[in-house]
């Protein structure tokens, strides 16, 4: 009696179970009662990443430099090329189809997490006692200067964008 289901890594065709082609190979001809499934390796710049019965291999992805992309991992017969973004940019989607410039944290904000090839800069407001006076994709908030450790007093309060201004003790009123 012809099978209605096949084992793993097999497929049903013409009432019989044939072996699937292994990753990195494509199907040339189905098996018969007398012959095994015929498979051929994928060509250069092609791949198939699963056990399959595909008659054509997929083209390796092209990392388009004009879109800010570069190769992170070269493709093989069994895997696609992995793209990432050039320095100073990050992927805008999970598949890294395009890149965007890392955002900078504005004055009053510091970098909480530096951007990577796959994630943008994360900024956070500088709390009281800290400041950032620059727009930067790398700098954290800086602590206000401690005037007392320099035998000075605060002449002007700090803000989230400016450091305190220290002055001599003799300006006490």
């Amino acid at each position: 009696e012809p099978p209605t289901a096949c084992r793993e890594k097999q497929y049903l065709i013409n009432s019989q179970c044939c072996s699937l082609c292994q990753p990195g190979q494509k199907l040339v001809s189905d098996c018969t009662e007398f012959t095994e499934t015929e498979c051929l390796p994928c060509g250069e710049s092609e791949f198939l990443d699963t056990w399959n019965r595909e008659t054509h291999c997929h083209q390796h992805r092209h990392c388009e430099p004009n879109q800010g992309l570069r190769v992170k991992k070269e493709g093989t017969a069994e895997s696609d090329t992995v793209c990432t973004c050039k320095e100073g940019q990050h992927c805008t989607s999970k598949d890294c189809e395009a890149c965007a410039q890392h955002r900078s944290c504005s004055p009053g904000f510091g970098v909480k997490q530096i951007a990577t090839g796959v994630s943008d800069t994360i900024c956070e407001p500088c709390p009281v006692g800290f400041f950032s006076n620059v727009s930067s994709a790398f700098e954290k908030c800086h602590p206000w200067t401690s005037c007392e450790t320099k035998d000075l007093v605060v002449q002007q309060a700090g803000t989230n964008k400016t450091d305190v201004v220290c002055g001599p003790q003799d300006r006490l009123r």
């Epitope: 956070e124 709390p127 009281v128 800290f130 908030c141 007392e148 002449q155 002007q156 989230n160």
Partner: antibody, heavy 122, light 113 residues
Framework: QVQLQQSGAELMKPGASVKIPCKAT????????IEWVKQRPGHGLEWIGE????????NYNEKFKGKATFTADTSSNTAYMQLSSLTSEDSAVYYC???????????????WGQGTLVTVSA | DIVMSQSPSSLAVSVGEKVTMSCKSS????????????LAWYQQKPGQSPKLLIY???TRESGVPDRFTGSGSGTDFTLTISSVKAEDLAVYYC?????????FGGGTKLEIK
């Protein structure tokens, strides 16, 4: 120990000004912010601003700019808050307070005065 | 400005009961640079000045009974009184000191049944 002493109640006419003192003892007055807080019934607590007596440096809540003015006299260890052009909205208890740390950590208010009740009435 | 919201606005409990009250901020009060939450809790008994209970969201002020516990991080905070005493009748306020202007919650009034 740290103490902040405030004056008693003040009854003021609309349009007038009032200057509320806060006398500090038990610490180096010039080195710590003096905070000012307003409390109206049903309105909770509102931060008005702060003054650093050593330099006269100030931070104001935008809402109270033009209404409150802070000064400090280091010779008498007294901070002052002047409220101008008084209206019934200014009727409240006004507290002075002092943070635990000096000036660079953000302020939670560890020490409080007993409050000054200001009543504005014609 | 950072908006602080407290709930409930009032609650009545019996002596010995556990009570929790909530404080939420409109932006995170956790600074990654020092992993501290810039939040304090105060108790104000009738006719008195506010009194500091908790700072850095969970550090108990010296002399405050250990039945008072602060917890939470980011934007959600809780003050818990493990076993309420009659003397805990008060209004409880949270305050953020992350950024100017410092702001307080509207308060939670604790009444004793």
């Amino acid at each position: 120990q740290v103490q902040l002493q405030q004056s008693g109640a003040e009854l003021m006419k609309p349009g007038a000004s009032v200057k509320i003192p806060c006398k500090a003892t038990g610490y180096t007055f010039s080195s710590y912010w003096i905070e000012w807080v307003k409390q109206r019934p049903g309105h909770g607590l509102e931060w008005i601003g702060e003054v650093l007596p050593g330099s006269g440096s100030t931070n104001y809540n935008e809402k109270f700019k033009g209404k409150a003015t802070f000064t400090a006299d280091t010779s008498s260890n007294t901070a002052y808050m002047q409220l101008s052009s008084l209206t019934s909205e200014d009727s409240a208890v006004y507290y002075c307070a002092r943070p635990y740390y000096r000036y660079d950590v953000g302020a939670w208010f560890a020490y409080w005065g007993q409050g000054t009740l200001v009543t504005v009435s014609a | 400005d950072i908006v602080m919201s407290q709930s409930p606005s009032s609650l009545a409990v019996s002596v010995g009961e556990k009570v929790t009250m909530s404080c939420k901020s409109s932006q995170s009060l956790l600074y990654s640079g020092n992993q501290k939450n810039y939040l304090a809790w105060y108790q104000q008994k009738p006719g008195q000045s506010p009194k500091l209970l908790i700072y850095w969201a969970s550090t108990r002020e010296s002399g405050v009974p250990d039945r008072f516990t602060g917890s939470g991080s980011g934007t959600d905070f809780t003050l818990t009184i493990s076993s309420v005493k009659a003397e805990d009748l008060a209004v409880y306020y949270c305050q953020q000191y992350y950024s100017y202007p410092y702001t307080f919650g509207g308060g939670t009034k604790l009444e004793i049944k």
